[in-house]
Amino acid sequence: ACDTATCVTHRLAGLLSRSGGVVKNNFVPTNVGSKAF
């Protein structure tokens, strides 16, 4: 899977939209590595 910063950001945005936009403080691109996906 793509693990560039941009890919991580877009994947996280997708997860957030599917979860209804629930955001935890640590659930941001700069804190979430590619392994989280």
């Epitope: 890919c7 957030l16 941001v28 691109p29 700069t30």
Partner: antibody, heavy 119, light 107 residues
Framework: EVQLVQSGAEVKKPGASVKVSCKAS????????MNWVRQAPGQRLEWIGD????????TYNQKFKGRATLTVDKSASTAYMELSSLRSEDTAVYYC????????????WGQGTTVTVSS | DIQMTQSPSSVSASVGDRVTITCKAS??????VAWYQQKPGKSPKALIY???YRYSGVPSRFSGSGSGTDFTLTISSLQPEDFATYYC?????????FGGGTKVEIK
């Protein structure tokens, strides 16, 4: 409103260094990666590198490795791009850019900083 | 580095025309492609990410498609404000790379 505001135009001599700043507002600066891209006159866009403002971890285009240095000042929500050993081919507009998810999912770019390298 | 080859380099079109721009990657980049619009003296403006998703506020006349190595940006009905240069970008692997641009000019 998300904004990326860059420092003003610079004129430098060959061999000198330049440091461009990018002040972010309207979002949590440390949450999103900051990219730096340049565009020489009449040329395609060229990616320089990115930085994780939270950790300071950087990834560079090998073409610029050793000459470009990306840093951040978290307290000032500002990113910096320093380019050393300037040559005439470095004459370009330099942009900072960041893909933000909250408050708006969008790819925001600074207004650009013109760097002219001339003897 | 992955090469992104755009075609055509320029296209002359009229308001209302359908315009198609293609971008070919030198290797598989999945769907990790973005499209940007740039007007003279201005910063690039993001249009499309993940090959086919429009950013919020981007008019529906802009659409993207493709995966792997072949990608397309289509403007279904060209408007006066669409005359600009368009760039594709791959972000599947470092370094990110851009196409050479397609200038959409008034016929």
């Amino acid at each position: 409103e998300v904004q990326l505001v860059q420092s003003g135009a610079e004129v430098k001599k060959p061999g000198a260094s330049v440091k461009v700043s990018c002040k972010a507002s309207g979002y949590t600066f440390t949450d999103y990666y900051m990219n730096w891209v340049r565009q020489a006159p009449g040329q395609r866009l060229e990616w320089i590198g990115d930085i994780n403002p939270n950790s300071g971890v950087t990834t560079y285009n090998q073409k610029f490795k050793g000459r470009a240095t990306l840093t951040v000042d978290k307290s000032a929500s500002t990113a910096y791009m320093e380019l050393s050993s300037l040559r005439s081919e470095d004459t370009a507009v330099y942009y900072c850019a960041s893909i933000i998810i909250v408050p708006d999912y969008f790819d925001y770019w600074g207004q650009g900083t013109t760097v002219t390298v001339s003897s | 580095d992955i090469q992104m080859t755009q075609s055509p380099s320029s296209v002359s079109a009229s308001v209302g025309d359908r315009v198609t721009i293609t971008c070919k990657a030198s290797q598989n980049v999945g769907s990790n492609v973005a499209w940007y619009q740039q007007k003279p003296g201005k910063s690039p403006k993001a249009l499309i990410y993940s090959a086919s998703y429009r950013y919020s506020g981007v008019p529906s006349r802009f659409s993207g498609s493709g995966s792997g190595t072949d990608f397309t940006l289509t403007i279904s009905s060209l408007q006066p404000e669409d005359f600009a240069t368009y760039y594709c970008q791959q972000y599947n692997s470092y370094p990110y790379t851009f196409g050479g641009g397609t200038k959409v000019e008034i016929k």
